[in-house]
C-alpha cells in the first residue's frame, strides 16, 4: 500500500510532511528518500513541535484514523546487533540521515535491551487527547514492520526535507489562488515558508471562469542566503478592493493611485525591496542577518554590513555565521592541545604539570620531592616519571612497585647462608647455634662450646639488628618460619649442620653481608639469595627440641 493523505509544514530550512498509510519503516524511508528526504529527525523540542504541527494538520484531514492510539515512523533506528546504551539520550539508536547523538529525547517508557533484531522508533499519538505544544508525541520503540504485510505496520510516517533556504510566501493584493509545488512533489496553497526551487502558480481573480490570469514564479537564490520569487509589485491586485484586500499585498503601507493602481510603501527607517512589496530596515543590521553569535557591524553611511565573530571564532563561507577556530592546528601547546568552543586549552602528559617558560609549557613533576614521594623507601625522579628502590634486604612489592618487602634470607633457592640456625630480621638476618654450640667469628658457622642447656644463640638485641632506616616493614626478628596448618608462621629456626672446626665462643651477632656500594643513602637492591634449611645435627627424640625465640615486639615469632 502506498502513502495516502499528506500534510506539510515548512519552517526554518526544513519541510516536514506527514503521510498516512500502513508501510514498514523501510518502505516509509524509501518513500521519503525518493523525494530527496529522510524519515524525520526530532532533535530538539522545537523540532518536535514542528512535527506535531504537521501531524495535527494530517489528522484534521484524515477522518479514517479511528484508532485511539496512532503511530508514525520517524528516522530513529537501531541496527541488528547494536545493543541498548542506557547512558545516551538516544539509547544507542541513531538518525537514519546520520548526524550526532542529540541530547533531546522523549521516550514513552523504559527500553528493554534486545540486540537480536533491528528496532525502529515511531511517534505515539493519543488521538483522544488534543495535540498541545506542551504534550509532545512520545517515542515508541518496536519492530520495524515488514514490507508487503500491512497488518504488521503502523498508521503512517513523517518525512523531513532540508533546503539551503526559503522564500517568503507570495502576498496577494487581491483575490487569487496560489499553488506551490515543492521539490519533494507536494502541492500546497498555504505554506509559511516556501522551500528553495519550489514553483508558485498564481491564478488571479475570483471564480472559475477563464478570466483568471495566471502567473508562474520560481523560488531562486538571488544572492548568497537571499531567496526570492523575482516578482515585482503586489500580485492579483484588484481595483474594487484597493488596499482593503490583504493590505494590497504590501508588507507595510499601501497607497492607492487615482487610476485604481496602488503602490506599496514603507515606514520611516525602512526601504522598499526589489519585489516592490517587502520593506527592509534602512539599517541592514536590524534584520539580524548575522548568526551563530556573530555581531552585525554597519558599513560606511549605514549602507551595508559585515558580521564580526567573537574571539576564537571565524566567519564561515556565507560570511554570516561564526564557526569555532581550531587553534590546535597551530600546535600552541608543548604537549596536548584540546580545542574548545571559542578557544583551546593545553594539557600536560601524565608525569608533567603546567609550568616552565612560555604559554602551554609543561615541566616534569618531581614525584620524589619531600612530602609527596610515593615510594616506601628509595625514590629516583626521572623525566616524566620516577622509580622506586629498596634498601638492602628488601625487594620492590605492591601492584604499583612502590612498596618494599623484606627479603627472607633464611628461605629460598640460593642454598644455606647459616650452617645451623637462621634468624630473619627486617632487612637482614643472622645465624645462631643450637644449645652447646657457639657461633664462629665468621657469623655463619657453629663450633662446639661448653655444654649448656640454655636457649640457642638467638636474635640480637634491638640495637644490633642492622635494620635499615625508612623501612615500612614491621620490625620483627624471627627465626625463619615453617607454615602451620592454618598458614600461621611458626617461629622455628631453620637449622643447618654446624661446623665443628671452629673454636669461636657462642655469640649472637647480626650478619652484615652484601654491603651496598655506591653513594651513602642510596641502597642497591641485594641479589635475592635465600638460604634453604640445611639438615642440622641429630635432634633429640621427639623432634620438638627447637627453641622458640622471643620477638622484641611481643609477637610469638610471627612476621
Amino acid at each position: 500500500t502506498g502513502a495516502d493523505t499528506e500534510a506539510v509544514v515548512c519552517v526554518g530550512t526544513a519541510c516536514y510532511t506527514a503521510h498516512s498509510g500502513k508501510l514498514s519503516a523501510a518502505e516509509a524511508q524509501n518513500h521519503c528518500n525518493q523525494n530527496g528526504g529522510n524519515l524525520a529527525t526530532v532533535k530538539s523540542k522545537e523540532e518536535a513541535q514542528h512535527v506535531q504541527r504537521v501531524l495535527a494538520q494530517l489528522l484534521r484531514r484524515e477522518a479514517a484514523l479511528t484508532a485511539r492510539m496512532s503511530k508514525f515512523w520517524i528516522g530513529l533506528q537501531r541496527e541488528k546487533g547494536k545493543c541498548l546504551d542506557p547512558s545516551l539520550p538516544l539509547k544507542g539508536f541513531s538518525w537514519v540521515g546520520g548526524g550526532e547523538d542529540t541530547p533531546y529525547s522523549n521516550w514513552h517508557k523504559e527500553l528493554r535491551n534486545s540486540c537480536i533484531s533491528k528496532r525502529c522508533v515511531s511517534l505515539l499519538l493519543d488521538l483522544s487527547q488534543p495535540l498541545l505544544p506542551s504534550r509532545l508525541p512520545k517515542w515508541s520503540e518496536g519492530p520495524c514492520g515488514s514490507p508487503g504485510s500491512p497488518g504488521s505496520n503502523i498508521e503512517g510516517f513523517v518525512c523531513k526535507f532540508s533546503f539551503k533556504g526559503m522564500c517568503r510566501p507570495l502576498a496577494l493584493g487581491g483575490p487569487g489562488q496560489v499553488t506551490y509545488t515543492t521539490p519533494f512533489q507536494t502541492t500546497s496553497s498555504s505554506l509559511e515558508a516556501v522551500p528553495f526551487a519550489s514553483a508558485a502558480n498564481v491564478a488571479c481573480g475570483e471564480g472559475d471562469k477563464d478570466e483568471t490570469q495566471s502567473h508562474y514564479f520560481l523560488c531562486k537564490e538571488k544572492a548568497p542566503d537571499v531567496f526570492d520569487w523575482g516578482s515585482s509589485g503586489p500580485l492579483c491586485v484588484s481595483p474594487k478592493y484597493g488596499c482593503n484586500f490583504n493590505n494590497g499585498g504590501c508588507h507595510q503601507d499601501c497607497f492607492e493611485g487615482g487610476d485604481g493602481s496602488f503602490l506599496c510603501g514603507c515606514r520611516p527607517g525602512f526601504r522598499l525591496l526589489d519585489d516592490l512589496v517587502t520593506c527592509a530596515s534602512r539599517n541592514p543590521c536590524s534584520s539580524s542577518p548575522c548568526r551563530g553569535g556573530a555581531t552585525c557591524v554597519l558599513g560606511p553611511h549605514g549602507k551595508n554590513y559585515t558580521c564580526r565573530c567573537p574571539q576564537g571564532y571565524q566567519l564561515d563561507s556565507s560570511q554570516l555565521d561564526c564557526v569555532d577556530v581550531d587553534e590546535c592546528q597551530d600546535s600552541p601547546c608543548a604537549q596536548e592541545c584540546v580545542n574548545t568552543p571559542g578557544g583551546f586549552r593545553c594539557e600536560c602528559w601524565v608525569g608533567y604539570e603546567p609550568g616552565g617558560p612560555g604559554e602551554g609549557a609543561c615541566q616534569d613533576v618531581d614525584e620524589c620531592a619531600l612530602g609527596r614521594s610515593p615510594c616506601a623507601q628509595g625514590c629516583t625522579n626521572t623525566d616524566g616519571s620516577f622509580h622506586c628502590s629498596c634498601e638492602e634486604g628488601y625487594v620492590l612489592a605492591g601492584e604499583d612497585g612502590t612498596q618494599c618487602q623484606d627479603v627472607d634470607e633464611c628461605v629460598g633457592p640460593g642454598g644455606p647462608l647459616c650452617d645451623s640456625l637462621c634468624f630473619n630480621t627486617q632487612g637482614s638476618f643472622h645465624c645462631g647455634c643450637l644449645p652447646g654450640w657457639v657461633l664462629a667469628p665468621n657469623g655463619v658457622s657453629c663450633t662446639m662450646g661448653p655444654v649448656s642447656l640454655g636457649p640457642p644463640s638467638g636474635p640480637p638485641d634491638e640495637e644490633d639488628k642492622g635494620e635499615k632506616e625508612g623501612s615500612t616493614v614491621p620490625r620483627a626478628a624471627t627465626a625463619s618460619p615453617t607454615r602451620g596448618p592454618e598458614g600461621t608462621p611458626k617461629a622455628t629456626p631453620t637449622t643447618s649442620r654446624p661446623s665443628l672446626s671452629s673454636d669461636a665462643p657462642i655469640t649472637s651477632a647480626p650478619l652484615k653481608m652484601l654491603a651496598p656500594s655506591g653513594s651513602p643513602g642510596v641502597w642497591r637492591e641485594p641479589s635475592i639469595h635465600h638460604a634453604t634449611a640445611a639438615s642440622g645435627p641429630q635432634e633429640p627424640a621427639g623432634g620438638d627440641s627447637s627453641v622458640a625465640t622471643q620477638n622484641n615486639d611481643g609477637t610469638d615469632g610471627q612476621k
Partner: antibody, heavy 115, light 113 residues
Amino acid sequence: EVQLQESGGGLVKPGGSLKLSCAASGFTFSRYAMSWVRQTPEKRLEWVASISSGGGTYYPDSVKGRFTISRDNARNILYLQMSSLRSEDSAMYYCVRDGNYPDYWGQGTTLTVSS
Amino acid sequence: DIVMSQSPSSLAVSVGEKVTVSCKSSQSLLYSSNQKNYLAWYQQKPGQSPKLLIYWASTRESGVPDRFTGSGSGTDFTLTVSSVKAEDLAVYYCQQYYRYPYTFGGGTKLEIK
C-alpha cells in the same frame, strides 16, 4: 446551472432585526465573492454588502455597523444579518454572484420595514 | 463614491429601430494594470431580477443576442441595441464594479411604440 435562492424576507418593525439567506448551487461557491444588492420600491439599485472568497467584508456607509454579511462555504449559503432596521431599508434583496464581475442574480426576497 | 449617470431615463422606440443608452462615471473605470474597464450593463424585464448583458464594458455575456453591443472607455460608455425587438422591453442599468461601493446608474426604461 447556476442557481441562487434567497429566503428570509418579511415584515419587520423599525429597529427590528432579520436574517436573510441565499442558497447557492451549480458552481464552486467558495471560490467566488458574493454580494447583496437591493432594489428600492422606486426601482433604484443599491449595493448593500460584499464578501470576498477569502472572507473579507465590505459595506457602504449607509448600512455599516447595522448589517453583517457572512458565508458558510461548507453548506454553500450566504447570509445577511440586518439589525436596527429603518423604513428606508425596505426593498427587494438580491443575492449576487460576484466573480471578476457580478454575473448571476437570484430572484430576490422582499423586506418591508413598517410600524 | 463613484457616481454613475445614465441617460435617457426612458425612451420609446419602434421594433427594428436602433437604440443608444449612455452612461457616464465620475471617475475613470479603466484599470491601468489590465487595461480593462470595470463596467457592466444589466437588463431587468418586468417581474424579473436583473440579468447581465455586457461586462468589461464591451464583452457580451454568453447567450446574449449580438444586437446588444457595449462600447466606451474611461468615463463614457454606451449600450447599443442595433435592432430592437419586442422582448427587449425592459429597464437597462449600468454599474461600475471598479471600486466598492458598487454603484448603479438610475436606469433607462425602454418602451416599444
